[in-house]
């Protein structure tokens, strides 16, 4: 389907000139920020960002490509080396140290410099680096923590977390012998290495002792508690904190995001992580917009400003299966996100960061009709005279065979949310990719973000935007709207 | 307040049984797990049994196939019945209730006593 107005030049001269006059309007903030937000797509390469625009725009009952996403709209855009120090293609942990914390570590190791090695727990004292939040945090800014995952898990465990093991959850996770030798499992380190203000996510079973039931799933014994130690984390946490309170459905949350009196908030919506935004149950869990929006109203009563991250986790996981439709609805619930964080703050005084820790051996090709589904075929067959797919990965569990060949697809199997896209290379879970992945920026500062940069310079970014160790020297103009 | 009473402990010889009891009485949050864990001399308490008010039931691996968790959700009563006792069953056995964390205002997590279990011969 060719729409009319797009077969004349004007039409694309008049947007493109539309574009650079955007384009030459742009002014530098020069100002400092008050208020630090990162946006993370897990495993958010650039191409699931296009598919996912194109989801997106199709859901509207547009063609898809020509309507922008929420983040499309940010002014400034740069590329990041994902790299771990020890690895070409990284992981989870390693990248949120880069990008959180501004140093580049090893492969599975969160918030330690290079100089600690996976798994080895002697390690880890004396290599330990500071997030930006806990920076924000020192600063007198309120912080926040929001995720579709487990707050525990290597994304948002980056921002106060320090572990030679991204996996060591709770105490049950850590083996003995790093246990004695001092190492704390995350969920301890959520509580106790800084205070966090609002955090928001899944991870309940790892804050109770095992045998503690799960108020969602009572009847259910591998969802409930799974410490050794005996302790609740969670009670703990609420006894060191007036004004605390700790939620765990939907409509606790909105409540407490409405009480003046709640100063500290801990949301944990699941025994892991959160579901897929497809498999959600809207009455008992939130969406990601949901407890970002939850997250702004807490953390934006503070004058001094705050720090907050949000995290669409679970995009990764969608990719990890091979099912293209869990990772690109994921994706959209997170560009909403996006849009509504950007109705609540102001780019006066916001630095709004978007991007990827890695991306995904995801493809988009085959020269499908513009217009058609984002799940559809490609219009030709291949060289075995069988359909295949637009979206396909590189490797992953897409990969079978029947009777010994690559099994025929219709385009009924393919729009379904089960379909596993097809690979090349049969692996139990798809892998990550090493190229570049997008930065998006708006705000103070954001004019740095530019060109092709490491993952570390995000962070710095962002220290240096909200005058941060080590940039508390920034020569910067105090943030829009305030006198001090 | 929730009060837990033990019974049914004692000495037995090894390849003996012994069958626990434990009552719960007071203001009972009616989704909820009751248990039975054991604490060695000079080791942490671990896990033995517990069964759901909907009806699951978990055992550690060192006691399955030997020992059987039963309750009453009516009387508000668990029971271990342990078979086949060896010398390393032997350990204070304490009664356990838990509601879901965050279901209930004040305290969730209440214990008994001990029941002491000794498998000598």
């Known amino acids: 389907i060719i729409p009319v107005e797009e077969e004349n030049p004007d039409f694309w001269n008049r947007e493109a000139a539309e574009a650079l006059g955007a384009a030459k309007k742009l002014q530098p903030a020069q100002t400092a920020a008050k208020n630090l937000i990162i946006f993370l797509g897990d495993g958010m390469g650039v191409s699931t960002v296009t598919a996912a625009r194109i989801l997106k725009g199709q859901k509207k009952d547009k063609l898809g490509p020509e309507i922008p996403l929420a983040m499309d709209r940010f002014p400034y855009v740069a590329l990041s080396k994902t790299y771990n120090v020890d690895k070409h293609v990284p992981d989870s942990g390693a990248t949120a140290t880069a990008y959180l914390c501004g140093v580049k570590g090893n492969f599975q190791t969160i918030g330690l410099s290079a100089a600690a090695r996976f798994n080895q727990c002697n390690t880890t004292r004396g290599n330990e680096v500071i997030s930006v939040m806990n920076r924000a945090k020192k600063a007198g800014k309120s912080v926040g923590v929001v995720t579709t995952t487990r707050v525990q898990h290597a994304s948002p465990a980056g921002t106060y977390a320090h572990t030679v093991n991204r996996n060591w959850y709770s105490d049950a996770d850590v083996p003995a012998s790093a246990r004695q030798e001092g190492c704390q499992d995350i969920a301890t380190q959520l509580i106790s290495n800084m205070d966090i203000d609002v955090i928001l996510g899944g991870g309940r079973k790892y804050m109770f002792r095992m045998g503690t039931p799960d108020p969602e799933y009572p009847d259910d014994y591998s969802q409930g508690g799974t410490r050794l130690d005996g302790k609740n984390l969670v009670q703990e946490w609420l006894a060191k904190r007036q004004g605390a309170r700790y939620v765990w459905n939907r409509t606790e949350l909105m409540q407490a995001s409405l009480d003046p009196s709640v100063t500290h908030l801990m949301g944990l919506f699941e025994p892991g992580d959160m579901k897929y935004e497809i498999h959600r149950d809207s009455t008992l869990d939130p969406s990601l917009m949901e407890m970002t929006e939850a997250a702004l109203r807490l953390l934006s009563r503070n004058p001094r400003g705050f720090f907050l991250f949000v995290e669409g986790g679970r995009i990764d996981h969608g990719h990890h299966e091979s099912r293209a439709y869990r990772a690109l609805t994921e994706t959209i619930m997170f560009d909403d996100a996006i849009e509504r964080a950007g109705q609540l703050t102001s780019e006066e005084d916001t630095l709004s960061l978007v991007t990827a820790d890695h991306s995904h051996v995801f493809s988009f090709g085959g020269y499908p009709l513009r217009g058609s589904s984002i799940f559809g075929l490609a219009p030709g067959k291949a060289r075995d005279r069988k359909a295949y797919t637009v979206l396909l990965y590189g490797n992953g569990p897409g990969y079978v065979l029947k009777d010994g060949a690559r099994p025929d697809v219709t385009e009924s199997e393919s729009g379904s949310p089960e379909y596993r896209q097809q690979s090349a290379v049969p692996l139990d879970e798809e892998t990550h990719a090493g190229e570049d992945v997008a930065v998006f920026a708006r705000g103070p500062q954001a004019h740095l973000v530019h060109g092709v940069q490491e993952q570390t310079f995000i962070a710095h970014v962002m220290a240096f935007a909200a005058c941060l160790e080590p940039y508390t020297a920034c020569d910067l103009a105090p943030p829009a709207g305030t006198t001090d | 307040q929730v009060q837990l009473v033990e019974s049914g402990g004692g000495l037995v010889q090894p390849g003996g049984s012994l069958r626990l009891s434990c009552a719960a009485s007071g203001s009972i949050f009616s989704v909820n797990t009751m248990g039975w864990y054991r604490q060695a001399p000079g080791k942490q308490r671990d896990l033995v049994a517990v069964a759901t008010s909907g009806g699951t039931i978990h055992y550690a691996d060192s006691v399955k196939g030997r020992f059987t968790i039963s309750r009453d959700n009516a009387k508000n009563t668990v029971y271990l019945q342990m078979n086949s006792l060896k010398p390393e069953d032997t350990a204070v056995y304490y009664c356990?209730?838990?509601?879901?964390?965050?279901?209930?205002?004040?305290?969730?997590?209440?214990w008994g006593q001990g029941t002491k279990v000794t498998v000598s011969s």
């Open positions: 356990n209730l838990v509601v879901p964390y965050g279901m209930i205002a004040g305290d969730h997590d209440y």
